[in-house]
């Protein structure tokens, strides 16, 4: 056999020889020879490798630092990293979720379009005509103005995007 110039999937070329890669969850101890296969060892506690590899060191599991508002969503294994998420009321500042910030509140005149999750912030929307929000909230949607007519009342003060209409009794015709 001629010395290889390329190797099969899950192999790597070293010293004109194709060696088996280490499986996920294991690290490389020594390259193969023509007499012995690649020597691999399992990653230690709190370490992982998630691909077929020739790494001599495993990666450390991510630490979900409670001081940064983080908590463990999914514990890491020898083949997967730990997944962090944020404490209630907080959300990740990036896709990697390395720190958290408090969910934003929607100011008066704005309502919650989408409630925040551990990985996404609150989405606010302006209250359209006929709706209002008079509080700063991370949960409240825009509320519809009160319908004075259904209460047999009349609008005494028009509503805005921050205030409800004010209803009052209908004026009585004098005799």
């Amino acid at each position: 056999p001629e010395p290889p110039t390329a190797c099969r999937e899950k192999q790597y070329l070293i010293n004109s020889q194709c060696c088996s890669l280490c499986q996920p969850g294991q690290k490389l101890v020594s390259d193969c020879t023509e007499f012995t296969e690649t020597e691999c060892l399992p990653c230690g506690e709190s370490e992982f490798l998630d691909t077929w590899n020739r790494e001599t060191h495993c990666h450390q599991h991510k630490y979900c630092d409670p001081n940064l508002g983080l908590r463990v969503q999914q514990k890491g294994t020898s083949e997967t990293d730990t997944i962090c998420t944020c404490e209630e009321g907080w959300h990740c500042t990036s896709e990697a979720c390395e720190s958290c910030v408090l969910h934003r509140s929607c100011s008066p005149g704005f309502g919650v379009k989408q409630i925040a999750t551990g990985v996404s912030d609150t989405i606010c929307e302006p209250c359209p005509v006929g709706f209002f929000s008079n509080v700063s909230s991370a949960f409240e949607k825009c509320h519809p103005w009160t319908s004075c007519e259904t209460k047999d009342l009349v609008v005494q003060q028009a509503g805005t995007n921050k205030t409800d209409v004010v209803c009052g009794p209908q004026d009585r015709l004098r005799a």
């Epitope: 056999p1 010395p3 010293n15 004109s16 020879t33 023509e34 007499f35 012995t36 296969e37 020597e39």
Partner: antibody, heavy 117, light 107 residues
Framework: EVQLLESGGGLVQPGGSLRLSCAAS????????MSWVRRAPGKGLEWVSG????????YYADSVKGRFTISRDNSKNTLYLQMNSLRAEDTAVYYC??????????WGQGTLVTVSS | DIQMTQSPSSLSASVGDRVTITCRAS??????LNWYQEKPGKAPKLLIY???SLQSGVPSRFSGSGSGTDFTLTISSLQPEDFATYYC?????????FGQGTKLEIK
Amino acid sequence: EVQLLESGGGLVQPGGSLRLSCAASGFTFSSYAMSWVRRAPGKGLEWVSGIGSYGGGTYYADSVKGRFTISRDNSKNTLYLQMNSLRAEDTAVYYCARYVNFGMDYWGQGTLVTVSS
Amino acid sequence: DIQMTQSPSSLSASVGDRVTITCRASQSISSYLNWYQEKPGKAPKLLIYAASSLQSGVPSRFSGSGSGTDFTLTISSLQPEDFATYYCQQYGRNPPTFGQGTKLEIK
């Protein structure tokens, strides 16, 4: 037809030296890793040493490291084992073998080395 | 070095018998194991490589199985020419090491 023929065995005193040869034929010698394996009287097989193809590395069992040297001459299709500082426990039949995919697929008939005073 | 322990050390059986020889590694070697047959005055012969693959030209009555630390060589129906000594050999760690052998004798 693949053939491996060992020679160079014999009786030697403790502390002495011997050089074993293995003449290969019937295949492209330079393309294969080769090894030496021995079997002591009444004992099992023991892998002694190996040499890679294409000028590859050399490897030894701990029991012979520093005393034995494996080499090859691809122009002569010959494998060698230089054995120095021989001990009584090195007494054995020595086989040369061809390696393919981590297995020894062809073996010679062996040559007897006796270390005794 | 990895220690390879074969059992039994010797075995008496009759032609037609099904025979199993086991080999245990002192640490995991995945499926990096070969089996050899040796007859008196003859060179050893490779039977099985990579724990379960039959070497070209070897009769199909020979089979191998196992991974990790425990391996077996099975001869489904013993033939007169199968009486010999059998060795396992690991290649998961340097240096390669053999088991002590199992001598298969005629009952």
